[in-house]
């Protein structure tokens, strides 16, 4: 399992370490989640051939996974700090239902799946403190999320495996784009 933020495995323990700044905490938190996703992807890819499948489009039709686009202001061209931060927080809030779906989808990495979910909640809190315009952030409707979760859990085994793979891949892409954008803020 990844080392919790603040004891990041990518840091050599330094004596008298300075307390982490807000930016550093966010960066570490995202790296921590990405490490967790890598571990979950390993189990998914080992368990099925989803990672090599060319039938992703079939399953993608059932999903509305958040994606970064140029209009979101997170790319270097047309970068807009406020618009981008709203997109990142909104996207993470939208991913929460999919992270809930991932719970119980893993055998040997059950704790890892929980860690990714909980760490994402903490990341959202960090980012909300950073955001000036919280009114612009739309929170997903709980009823809609509940019915989406029911629908995803009712899929056949193949679609459930494919959905798991797509969620992990999309979440990884979203976090990587977020990481780069946040480094410009």
């Amino acid at each position: 399992a990844p080392v919790p933020p603040g004891e990041d495995s990518k840091d050599v323990a330094a004596p008298h370490r300075q307390p982490l700044t807000s930016s550093e905490r966010i960066d570490k938190q995202i790296r921590y989640i990405l490490d967790g996703i890598s571990a979950l992807r390993k189990e998914t890819c080992n368990k099925s051939n989803m990672c090599e499948s060319s039938k992703e489009a079939l399953a993608e039709n059932n999903l509305n996974l958040p994606k970064m686009a140029e209009k979101d202001g997170c790319f270097q061209s047309g970068f807009n700090e406020e618009t981008c931060l709203v997109k990142i927080i909104t996207g993470l809030l939208e991913f929460e239902v999919y992270l809930e779906y991932l719970q119980n989808r893993f055998e040997s990495s059950e704790e890892q799946a929980r860690a990714v979910q909980m760490s994402t909640k903490v990341l959202i809190q960090f980012l909300q403190k950073k955001a000036k315009n919280l009114d612009a952030i739309t929170t997903p409707d709980p009823t809609t999320n509940a019915s989406l979760l029911t629908k995803l859990q009712a899929q056949n085994q193949w679609l459930q495996d494919m959905t798991t793979h797509l969620i992990l891949r999309s979440f990884k892409e979203f976090l990587q784009s977020s990481l780069r954008a946040l480094r410009q803020m």
């Epitope: 840091d11 990587q176 990481l179 780069r180």
Partner: antibody, heavy 120, light 106 residues
Framework: QVTLRESGPALVRPTQTLTLTCTFS??????????VGWIRQPPGEALEWLAH???????YYNPALKGRLAVSKDTSKNQVVLSMNTVGPGDTATYYC????????????WGQGILVTVSS | DIQMTQSPSSLSASVGDRVTITCRAS??????LAWYQQKPGKAPKLLIY???YLADGVPSRFSGSGSGTDYTFTISSLQPEDIATYYC????????FGQGTKVEIK
């Protein structure tokens, strides 16, 4: 096995546009987190980062050269193209392409480089 | 934009010596730093990424440390094949290289 190879003209006239192609194998620019960057090194001088392009078409440029550079990708051909307009003698250098993977963002594989001379 | 100041620009040491190179960023780069080795006429080679991680196949005599703005690259016991120029590079935003450190044998 990952390989990258730079190709383009060895000699360019001042004021012209330099176009370099990086052809790679062993990885795909469709893979999330993957990026290809361009770096140059004038003779006897230090490395200078120019630009890089990510799998999702996000592009980053050296601010000092931003107006003169354009980077694009053709994932079907496994190629990344760098264009630099209005070149001058100061652009004489060995140009390298390199790949970065994932959020550790270090250039783990490099091409062998191509020496480009700008002269009339 | 973040500037990288690498020192010294050159150094001369004996085989077996401990060699240290430093890189200072103009602001916090949160351990997003790589170190490269470049031999004459060759492309650079990645040695260290994320400030402390050894790249695949790199001998353990090379190491990296640091956090915040200050980073150090160390060769614990200099070997003849380590004669090269070493560069740091950060990855916080747009990534410049340090000016390089040329390592020679006394």
């Amino acid at each position: 096995q990952v390989t990258l190879r730079e190709s383009g003209p060895a000699l360019v006239r001042p004021t012209q546009t330099l176009t370099l192609t990086c052809t790679f194998s062993g990885f795909s620019l469709n893979t999330s987190g993957m990026t290809v960057g361009w770096i140059r090194q004038p003779p006897g001088e230090a490395l200078e980062w120019l630009a890089h392009i990510w799998w999702n078409d996000d592009k980053y440029y050296n601010p000092a050269l931003k107006g003169r550079l354009a980077v694009s990708k053709d994932t079907s051909k496994n190629q990344v193209v760098l264009s630099m307009n209005t070149v001058g003698p100061g652009d004489t250098a060995t140009y390298y392409c390199a790949r970065m993977e994932d959020y550790d963002e270090a250039m783990d594989y490099w091409g062998q480089g191509i020496l480009v001379t700008v002269s009339s | 934009d973040i500037q990288m100041t690498q020192s010294p620009s050159s150094l001369s040491a004996s085989v077996g010596d401990r060699v240290t190179i430093t890189c200072r960023a103009s602001e916090n780069i949160y351990s997003n730093l790589a170190w490269y080795q470049q031999k004459p006429g060759k492309a650079p080679k990645l040695l260290i990424y994320a400030a402390t991680y050894l790249a695949d196949g790199v001998p353990s005599r090379f190491s990296g440390s640091g956090s915040g703005t200050d980073y150090t690259f160390t060769i614990s016991s200099l070997q003849p094949e380590d004669i090269a120029t070493y560069y740091c590079q950060h990855f916080w935003g747009t990534p410049p290289f340090g000016q390089g450190t040329k390592v020679e044998i006394k």
